[in-house]
């Protein structure tokens, strides 16, 4: 533990996994659910102006894109990859990029991605071949 760091009661809040340094949680876009204009694009920006320090050091960035007959929404949050989100396991939680994967949901089109780089859920990718290009 670094000098003067108090002993933590809750180890989820303090991660010390290399040489005693304490790890800052990830920085993620965190706008919860917002209406989105992202549709039929290979990639999109979240248009979320809020970047939050995640609550726990092991949380990653998540984005959820949903389309139904009424609207399109994009959800941006932090989430623990050990826990499911919307009933689904967070795949590729260690990825530096947020590459959307379609999930089966009745009555809507549902894509979700997770990633573990600063603000990585700001740029969501629907085509894996498109990862090196700039957003539409």
């Amino acid at each position: 533990i670094p000098p003067h760091v108090p002993k933590s009661v809750n180890s989820d809040v303090m991660a010390s996994d290399n040489g005693g340094a304490v790890k800052l949680p990830q920085l993620c876009k965190f706008c919860d659910v917002r209406l989105s204009t992202c549709d039929n694009q290979k990639s999109c920006m979240s248009n979320c102006s809020i970047t939050a320090i995640c609550e726990k050091p092991h949380e990653v960035c998540v984005a959820v894109w949903r389309k139904n007959d009424k609207n399109i929404t994009l959800e941006t949050v932090c989430h623990d990859p050990k826990l499911t989100y919307h009933g689904f396991t967070l795949e590729d939680a260690a990825s530096p990029k947020c590459v959307m994967k379609e999930k089966k949901r009745a009555g809507e089109t549902f894509f979700m991605c997770a990633c573990n780089m600063e603000e990585c859920n700001d740029y969501i990718i629907f085509s894996e071949e498109y990862t090196t290009s700039s957003p539409d």
Epitope: P2, P3, G19, G20, A21, V22, K23, L24, T51, P57
Partner: nanobody, 119 residues
Framework: EVQLLESGGGLVQPGGSLRLSCAAS????????MAWVRQAPGKGLEWVSL????????YYANSVKGRFTISRDNSKNTLYLQMNSLRAEDTAVYYC????????????WGQGTLVTVSS
């Protein structure tokens, strides 16, 4: 030797304000990210706010966003946390922390300053 010395804590009523300071020495202050972290009684550490070397960007935990403001004066080697609209749940020991220069790791911490929000 790296030293971080927090001050400005105390007892304040709900809705009140406090300004914490952290005087830094022993390293090139204007080259490092700095953060405020707190520990409420019986709880784990909670990261409150982060600031980059030149003062921008700044980041906040959702629990304090819109109420707390982090800033720094590199000419004085000092980090600040302006806390407004304080709530009972903000009661904690507040620590300033220095970025290690690698990954997301912070390696030096102050002794802390106690903030008590109570009527």
């Amino acid at each position: 030797e790296v030293q971080l010395l927090e001050s400005g804590g105390g007892l304040v009523q709900p809705g009140g304000s406090l300004r914490l300071s952290c005087a830094a020495s022993g390293f090139t202050f204007d080259k490092y990210k700095m953060a405020w972290v707190r520990q409420a009684p019986g709880k784990g550490l909670e990261w409150v706010s982060l600031i980059f070397p030149n003062g921008v960007p700044t980041y906040y935990a959702n629990s304090v966003k819109g109420r707390f403001t982090i800033s720094r004066d590199n000419s004085k080697n000092t980090l600040y946390l302006q806390m407004n609209s304080l709530r009972a749940e903000d009661t904690a020991v507040y620590y300033c922390a220095k970025y290690s220069g690698q990954g997301r790791d912070f390696d030096y911490w102050g002794q802390g300053t106690l903030v008590t929000v109570s009527s």
